[in-house]
């Protein structure tokens, strides 16, 4: 005979769960499906990851996302985690938003990003709900910088990048400062592959760095080089 009253709580069917903190009156729920749609858009040394919520929320509203990163070396094909070397716009675990920016990616490296959706009962199953996206970083190579000539008050500097990448560069930014003076620096922009830095102090070391500017933003910066102007005794014009 049917019971005159309904049960105060019901066992969950297979594949459905109640989280420990769920009240007995709450319906049984299940883990979410994977994020529905994931894109990875590369911008220089950054990638913007965007995704849409799972089509099946599992009947819960407490969905959070975790992002993990793997990098692969193209020459060897070997791969490894890259959490230690990249920077996320916000902590990559327990995300409630559906986008994140990953920066400090290395040129010519292949990256695979995994976005996992979880809810309050995901910890009760061993399976994971995730989607992956891969991206190759094709940021311009750092310019190779040379000292072409110097005088007591100037330094002539040139640089090069591989010819296939030159068409992507619209300008080069040359930053320089006196060694030991980290409070002020000068910036010159040029479309060419060389510049003469004038009005410098004699017998003084300057720190010089060149960076390519591309449509996607800044390319990789060169090394910080140390170049020294001539002392008044050994002046000669633009000698190296």
């Amino acid at each position: 005979l049917p019971s005159p009253e309904g049960a105060t709580s019901c066992e969950c069917e297979e594949g459905f769960f109640r989280a420990p903190q769920d009240p007995a009156s709450m319906p049984c729920t299940r883990p979410p499906s994977a994020p529905h749609y994931l894109t990875a858009v590369g911008m220089g040394a950054k990638v913007e990851l965007r995704w849409t919520p799972p089509q099946d929320s599992g009947g819960r509203e407490d969905i959070v996302y975790s992002v993990t990163c793997e990098q692969c070396w193209p020459e060897s094909g070997e791969c490894g985690p890259c959490e230690a070397s990249v920077r996320y716009s916000e902590p990559p675990h327990g995300l409630t938003r559906t986008s994140v920016t990953v920066s400090d990616l290395e040129p010519h490296m292949n990256y695979t990003f995994t976005v996992e959706a979880r809810n309050g009962v995901s910890g009760l199953v061993t399976s994971r709900s995730f989607r992956t996206a891969s991206v190759s970083i094709n940021q311009t190579e750092p310019p190779k910088v040379r000292l072409e000539g110097r005088s007591t008050t100037s330094l002539s500097v040139s640089w090069s990048i591989p010819p296939p990448q030159q068409s992507r560069v619209w300008k080069y930014e040359v930053t320089y400062r006196k060694k030991g003076d980290s409070n002020s620096y000068n910036v010159r922009r040029t479309e060419g592959f060389s510049v003469t830095l004038d009005d410098l102090a004699p017998d003084t070391t300057y720190l010089v760095q060149v960076q390519a500017l591309t449509q996607e933003g800044q390319g990789a910066g060169s090394k910080v080089h140390e170049f020294q102007t001539l002392s008044p005794e050994g002046s000669g014009n633009l000698a190296v």
Partner: antibody, heavy 130, light 108 residues
């Protein structure tokens, strides 16, 4: 081929002054910044400071954490440079190395601060204990 | 002050490739040098200027550097490569020399 030979007292009491000397054999003494580096037992390398002797002037640069206690000096006539560390404590117990950079500091206007060290002294174990 | 971060230990089987990382803010703009140190001995320079090898250092040692990570790669690892490895840079902001904390390479 440049060689470095170092010597100095190996056992000190707290508050005493550590004193080590490094002799440079071969190479151009005034072209390089000469460094001292130390390594406490079971720990990593720590740069102490460097000196360059050009003309009659010594150019010094010290690790900020040791600066108040360190002096690195030069005897250019003997191609030697020395380390003095005052008011030592047990925390200064370490192997001390002198080292030569790979390249002259500046060549034709191109300079190499903090260059790689291609030649090291044999190391001197200095123990500070009461 | 500038900080270089190395993993305390890396383990690898003989014949495999070991990668030792050295992390630092915008380290790609600096020249990174690597040393090998065996117990009771002074350090030995194995790679300078990110990827150049001094004479006498075998080709199995190579290096790379970009972004915030420099890497020392030791291919075809053998028992004799077991040692501590240190990275080093010059911090041009403070004009001081900095070493990483060191990585102990264990050959299994």
């Amino acid at each position: 081929q440049v060689q470095l030979q170092q010597w100095g007292a190996g056992l000190l009491k707290p508050s005493e002054t550590l004193s080590l000397t490094c002799a440079v054999y071969g190479g151009s003494f005034s072209d390089y910044y000469w460094s001292w580096i130390r390594q406490p037992p079971g720990k990593g390398l720590e740069w102490i400071g460097e000196v360059n002797h050009r003309g009659s002037i010594n150019y010094n640069n010290y690790n900020p954490s040791l600066k108040s206690r360190v002096t690195i000096s030069v005897d250019a006539s003997k191609n030697q440079f020395s380390l003095k560390l005052t008011s030592v404590t047990a925390a200064d117990t370490a192997v001390y190395y002198c080292a030569k950079p790979l390249r002259p500091h500046c060549t034709n206007g191109v300079c190499y601060s903090g260059d790689a060290f291609d030649i090291w002294g044999q190391g001197t174990m200095v123990t500070v204990a009461s | 002050s500038y900080v270089l971060t190395q993993p305390p230990s890396v383990s690898v089987a003989p014949g495999q490739t070991a990668r030792i990382t050295c992390g630092g803010n915008n380290i790609g703009s600096k020249n990174v040098h690597w040393y090998q140190q065996k117990p009771g001995q002074a350090p030995v320079l194995v790679v300078y200027d990110d990827s150049d090898r001094p004479s006498g250092i075998p080709e199995q040692f190579s290096g790379s550097n970009s972004g915030n990570t420099a890497t020392l790669t030791i291919s075809r690892v053998e028992a004799g490569d077991e040692a501590d490895y240190y990275c080093q840079v010059w911090d041009s902001s403070s004009d001081h020399l900095v070493f990483g904390g060191g990585t102990k390479l264990t050959v299994l």
